[in-house]
Each structure stands twice: as structure tokens, then as C-alpha cells.
């Protein structure tokens, strides 16, 4: 390190030190001062520092502080928002996949179901997607319309197949037939929990995540006040007032500053704590009917379970129906 | 502007976005990110001694500032900050957060509610027995595996994994359906799911 | 450990020109803002001149401005002072220091005196 330098009679040293946050000289005094302006790096003696200096530092000073946070949290905001990021996109794949293991699963086992089962199945991932993202959906809704649209196609296509195109009227007597006579069993219930659960849970993972983005920027982009200015001047600068150019501060008045001027943020540690705590409780729970992978890799199989089922009773089911929508379809026949 | 916005005065950790090589679940991924998050659970606590370790602090020098005067490293004087006549510390700490930082505050606690809500623990929900009517059905509780995989002719059995690999390999993709000519038929009856998604390191 | 090893001083005639080397190790260089000081003899400390971490903005005192030129190569981790129509008042000896914060200094190096006379 450089000697201490001689004491300074000219202000010659802070002039220069100062033309480093500052270009122009007007605001450094020629000569020491007594300083009875300043309201941050109070003099013992004569001062080579102005109320203009005081303020420039002031100002740094903040400036350093914010910066100081955001090389802080930098780490942490990365790690949240690429994980975000890379789940949002995992879980628009797993909902395309299982889209495509659904209209597989038509197009091998029921190929006469394809093209109108292929626009339900696609209508129902779309909801299912809008979902996880935030949409106001209720899955029960989503999962009875799935069910409500496929199977006057089953009726007409499967079972029934010597009917003419279906008509509006007996398709909304099937649909209603549907729910009455719960003609797919208990299949539709057991979609529509594994579903809505694996959903809630994933969707809640996200903006929990995006909760975590959001706590990071705002704590990122605090406004250090005037008060926290003022000590962290007399901290880092006060001393080129005195000609002291390379002395640090004390640890422990470090440390004292820090606690003052960060008073604020650190309220959030407890909630912060428990955030990653609650989320991990989460993530552990995230499996079986919990896990939308899990769940929603696998609903192809469920729906052929409950098409079979349909089957299984088909002939029950074509006397009661036929017998439940007579009236629409004698309209139809007409 | 003497003061340059882009200087980061903390050693920037080269974060890189890795690609594994391995299969690699959701799920692993998801316990992946909470290891990781675990060792920020100090983070706003560990705030100021952390900024005083990435700024300068007396450590190695005799004498330091204690915001008034130089004074010597270990003496009393250089714990005493100097702030009398200044503002009150405590004061500053008194005022509590701003209001930015008491509605981030309240968001946590709402998010907190929720992901405690959703975290209770899960008996089974789901009675195994399906059909009321007695009919025989697909059989499939909430905590069985074979559940996924199939029944019947034709069916494809998946594999269920999501592979984070830097190519994107589907098999099948039937996004267009209706009237597409062009569909691939999974070969073996097998789909699996890959993707091209980085492994965040 | 941070350590600044300055070179490239010596005697040079009133006129002339010298090219200075600080060569950083121990820390992140091309993250830290860097600046030359230099102390006359028998007297205090002075700022020269400055430049960001990306080396995209430099600064200088006004005695210097338009003869010295500050420069860094990151990938060398080395940082320079180009000094040309030195003067007498230019004896000096030559300081390399690390910025932790905007113009507050945490490392210097050890300094290469620079002569100017005929």
C-alpha cells in the first residue's frame, strides 16, 4: 500500500478523489474549511468537504447499495427464474404428450371415434393447460365436458351404429343420459380427482415460483432511504473528507450499518423461511395423484378403461337409452 | 456519468445451463431446484453480513474508520459508529418495511397458507371399489402404478418420464389430427417423451 | 488473495511516453471497475483516471485528460495506462487499484515509480 501520505494544506489530494464520482472541481474547496454546512461527515477541524460533496457521496453511496443487492440476489433470481421457466415448458409438454397418448389410443382402438374424438381430447387439454397457467376453469367442468361430448360419438359410432348422423336433440339427450345413468361407471369421478388434484398442486407450484421471482425483483429494486444514505456516506466516504483515501470501515460499524439500513428486508426472513419450507413440504407430496405427470401420462388409459366399460355394458345401456331418448329420436327418424 | 452502472462489485458466479445425460424425472428435477433453494433459506437474514463481506472492511489493516475518526482495529472505538447526533438506529429500525417490501410480505403469507393447505397429509381418497353397480371395472386406486399402461389390444404402453436431453425426439405427434394423413403410428405401441429441456446448474 | 502487480516505470524524457501494466489475479477481474493513482513525491495521493469493469467507460482527472489513455484486457486479466507528453509534474510513483465500490478502494498494488526528466 502506498505511505500515508503527508497532511494535505491544499485539499489538492480530495479534489483529485473526488474528480472520480464528479468531473469538475467547483464544488471542493481550495483549502480546509470549517465545514458548519455539512450534515453527514461532521468535522473535528477544518474539512475538505461541502454540503454539494456531501451530497454527491450521499447519492454514490445509494447507488452502491443497490448494487451491492442485486450482485446479492443474483444467484438466487437465476436459479428461480430458469427453474420457472423450464418447469412452465415441462409441463406444456407432458399435457402435449398426453394429448398425443390420448388421440393414439383413439386412433389404435377406435379409429370410427378419431376425428370428433381427437377435437374433445384437444378441447379438454387446452383447458387443462389454461389451468396450470392461472385460468379460472373448474376441472370438474372440463373432465364432465370431455365425457358429455364423447360419448354420444360412442352411442352412435359404437354402440349403436345403425343410426343416422346424429342430430342435435338426441345428442343432448345422450349427454344428459350420460350423467343419469353414469354410463362410464365411476371412471369419470376417478378422472376428475386425480385430475383436479395433480392440477391444484401443480398450478400452486408454479405461482409459488413466480411468487419467489416476484419477491426477489422487489427486495432487488428496494429505494435505500435518506437515513441509510447518510450512514452509509459516513461509512464508505466520510473519511476522503479528512484526506483518509485508503482506510476501510471497522467490520462491526459495518455490520451496524447493514442491520439499519436493511431493517426492512430482513422482516421478510421468516415468511421467506417458511416459503421454502412449505414448498419443499409440497414437493414431497407432488407424486401418485399428486404428480400431473403421473396422472396425466396416464389418463389415455383410464379413458380406454372407460370406453370398455361402456362396452362391457352396452346392451343394458342401449335398452334404457333407447327407451330414455325415444322421443328424440322419433323426431330424428321423422 | 462517473459511476458505472454495470460493475458488480461480487465475483459473478458463471452460471451455466448444463444438459444431463441421464433420464431425468420431473420430479427429480423438482426436488433438485429444493436442495438448492434450501441453501438460500438464510438469504435475507444473511443480507448485511453479506454485503459487508463483499465491500470493503477493515480485515488485515491496524487501523480502520469507525465513521468518525481512524481508530485502532480491536479498540472499543471502532465498534462505536459514530451516528449520535446523526439519527438513532434504532429509530430507522422502528419504522418498519416499506410498503413495496409489507405486500410482498403479505403475498408470502398467502402463498405460505396455500402450500401448507395443499401440503395436509392425504389419506386415501379414492375408494378402490369404482363401479357402485358392480360391474367389473378398470380397477385402479389413487396409489397404484400399473395404472398407467394399459388394458386391452392395441394399447401403448408409456414410458413415463420426461428426459431433459438436448434433442427433441417424439415419436408421435398428432397435434393436428383431424384430417392429418401424415400421422406417425408408434412403433411397438410404445411412446416415449423426450425433450430438450437444460439442466439448470 | 487479491494481488496488483504494477510495471512498466522508469525514466523517460519530458515528451516522452511510457506504457504501464497491472497485472490482477485472486479475484473476478472483468467485474470490478479499476483505476491508476499515483503519489508525487512528498506529497498526497492523486486519482488519474478510471474504467468500468466491461471496459467500456473510462474517466480521467482533468490533469491528465488527452495525453493518458486507460485500457484493460480481460481475457489477460491485465490493466493499462498508456502515458504520452509526459511532463515533469508526472513523476510519480504509479499505484493500480481495485475498486470495490464506485470510487472507494479495497487493493492497491505496490507501485512503479515513473521518472520524467531531462
Known amino acids: 500500500q502506498p505511505p500515508p501520505p503527508p497532511p494535505d494544506a491544499t485539499c489538492h489530494q480530495v479534489r483529485s478523489f473526488f474528480q472520480r464520482l464528479q468531473p469538475g472541481l467547483k464544488w471542493v474547496p481550495e483549502t480546509p474549511v470549517p465545514g458548519s454546512d455539512l450534515q453527514v461527515c461532521l468535522p473535528k477541524g477544518p474539512t475538505c468537504c461541502s454540503r454539494k460533496m456531501e451530497e454527491k457521496y450521499q447519492l454514490t453511496a445509494r447507488l452502491n447499495m443497490e448494487q451491492l443487492l442485486q450482485s446479492a440476489s443474483m444467484e438466487l433470481k437465476f436459479l428461480i427464474i430458469q427453474n420457472a421457466a423450464v418447469f412452465q415448458e415441462a409441463f406444456e409438454i407432458v399435457v402435449r404428450h398426453a394429448k398425443n397418448y390420448t388421440n393414439a389410443m383413439f386412433k389404435n382402438n377406435y379409429p370410427s371415434l378419431t376425428p370428433q374424438a381427437f377435437e374433445f381430447v384437444g378441447e379438454f387439454f387446452t383447458d387443462v393447460s389454461l389451468y396450470i397457467l392461472g385460468s379460472d376453469i373448474n376441472v370438474d367442468d372440463m373432465v364432465n365436458e370431455l365425457f358429455d361430448s364423447l360419448f354420444p360419438v360412442i352411442y352412435t359410432q359404437l354402440m349403436n351404429p345403425g343410426l343416422p348422423d346424429s342430430a342435435l336433440d338426441i345428442n343432448e339427450c345422450l349427454r344428459g343420459a350420460r350423467r343419469d345413468l353414469k354410463v362410464f361407471g365411476n371412471f369419470p369421478k376417478l378422472i376428475m380427482t386425480q385430475v383436479s388434484k395433480s392440477l391444484q398442486v401443480t398450478r400452486i407450484f408454479l405461482q409459488a415460483l413466480n411468487l419467489g421471482i416476484e419477491v426477489i425483483n422487489t427486495t432487488d429494486h428496494l429505494k435505500f432511504s435518506k437515513d441509510c444514505g447518510r450512514m452509509l456516506t459516513r461509512m464508505w466516504y466520510c473519511s476522503y473528507c479528512q484526506g483518509l483515501m485508503m482506510v476501510k470501515p471497522c467490520g462491526g460499524y459495518c455490520n451496524v450499518v447493514m442491520q439499519g439500513c436493511m431493517a426492512g428486508v430482513v422482516e421478510i426472513d421468516k415468511y421467506w423461511r417458511e416459503y421454502i419450507l412449505s414448498l419443499e413440504e409440497l414437493v414431497n407430496g407432488m407424486y401418485r395423484i399428486y404428480d400431473m405427470e403421473n396422472v396425466l401420462l396416464g389418463l389415455f388409459s383410464t379413458i380406454h378403461d372407460s370406453i370398455q366399460y361402456v362396452q362391457k355394458n352396452a346392451g343394458k345401456l342401449t335398452t334404457t337409452i333407447g327407451k330414455l331418448c325415444a322421443h328424440s329420436q322419433q323426431r330424428q327418424y321423422r | 456519468s462517473a459511476y458505472y452502472p454495470e460493475d458488480l462489485f461480487i465475483d459473478k458466479k458463471v452460471l451455466k445451463v448444463a444438459h444431463v445425460e441421464h433420464e431425468e424425472t420431473l420430479s427429480s428435477r423438482r426436488r433438485e431446484l429444493i436442495q438448492k433453494l434450501k441453501s438460500f433459506i438464510s438469504f435475507y437474514s444473511a443480507l448485511p453480513g453479506y454485503i459487508c463481506s463483499h465491500s470493503p472492511v477493515a480485515e488485515n489493516d491496524t487501523l480502520c474508520w469507525n465513521g468518525q475518526e481512524l481508530v485502532e482495529r480491536y479498540s472499543q472505538k471502532a465498534a462505536r459508529n459514530g451516528m449520535k447526533n446523526q439519527f438513532n438506529l434504532h429509530e430507522l429500525k422502528m419504522k418498519g418495511p416499506e410498503p413495496v417490501v409489507s405486500q410482498i410480505i403479505d403475498k408470502l403469507k398467502h402463498i405460505n397458507q396455500l402450500l401448507r393447505t395443499m401440503s395436509m397429509p392425504k389419506g386415501r381418497v379414492l375408494d378402490k371399489n369404482l363401479d357402485e353397480e358392480g360391474f367389473e371395472s378398470g380397477d385402479c386406486g389413487d396409489d397404484e402404478d400399473e395404472c398407467i399402461g394399459g388394458s386391452g389390444d392395441g394399447m401403448i404402453k408409456v414410458k413415463n418420464q420426461l428426459r431433459f436431453l438436448a434433442e427433441l425426439a417424439y415419436d408421435l405427434d398428432v397435434d393436428d389430427a383431424p384430417g392429418n394423413s401424415q400421422q406417425a403410428t408408434p412403433k411397438d405401441n410404445e411412446i416415449s417423451t423426450f425433450h430438450n429441456l437444460g439442466n439448470v446448474h | 488473495q487479491v494481488q496488483l502487480v504494477e510495471s512498466g516505470g522508469g525514466l523517460v524524457q519530458p515528451g516522452g511516453s511510457l506504457r504501464l501494466s497491472c497485472a490482477a489475479s485472486g479475484f473476478t477481474f472483468s467485474s470490478f471497475a479499476m483505476s491508476w493513482v499515483r503519489q508525487a513525491p512528498g506529497k498526497g495521493l492523486e486519482w488519474v483516471s478510471a474504467i468500468s469493469g466491461s471496459g467500456g467507460r473510462t474517466h480521467y482527472a482533468d490533469s491528465v485528460k488527452g495525453r493518458f489513455t486507460i485500457s484493460r484486457d480481460n481475457s489477460k486479466n491485465t490493466l493499462y495506462l498508456q502515458m504520452n507528453s509526459l511532463r515533469a509534474e508526472d513523476t510519480a510513483v504509479y499505484y493500480c487499484?481495485?475498486?470495490?465500490?464506485?470510487?472507494?478502494?479495497?487493493?492497491w498494488g505496490q507501485g512503479t515509480l515513473v521518472t520524467v526528466s531531462s
Open positions: 487499484a481495485k475498486e470495490a465500490l464506485t470510487g472507494v478502494f479495497d487493493y
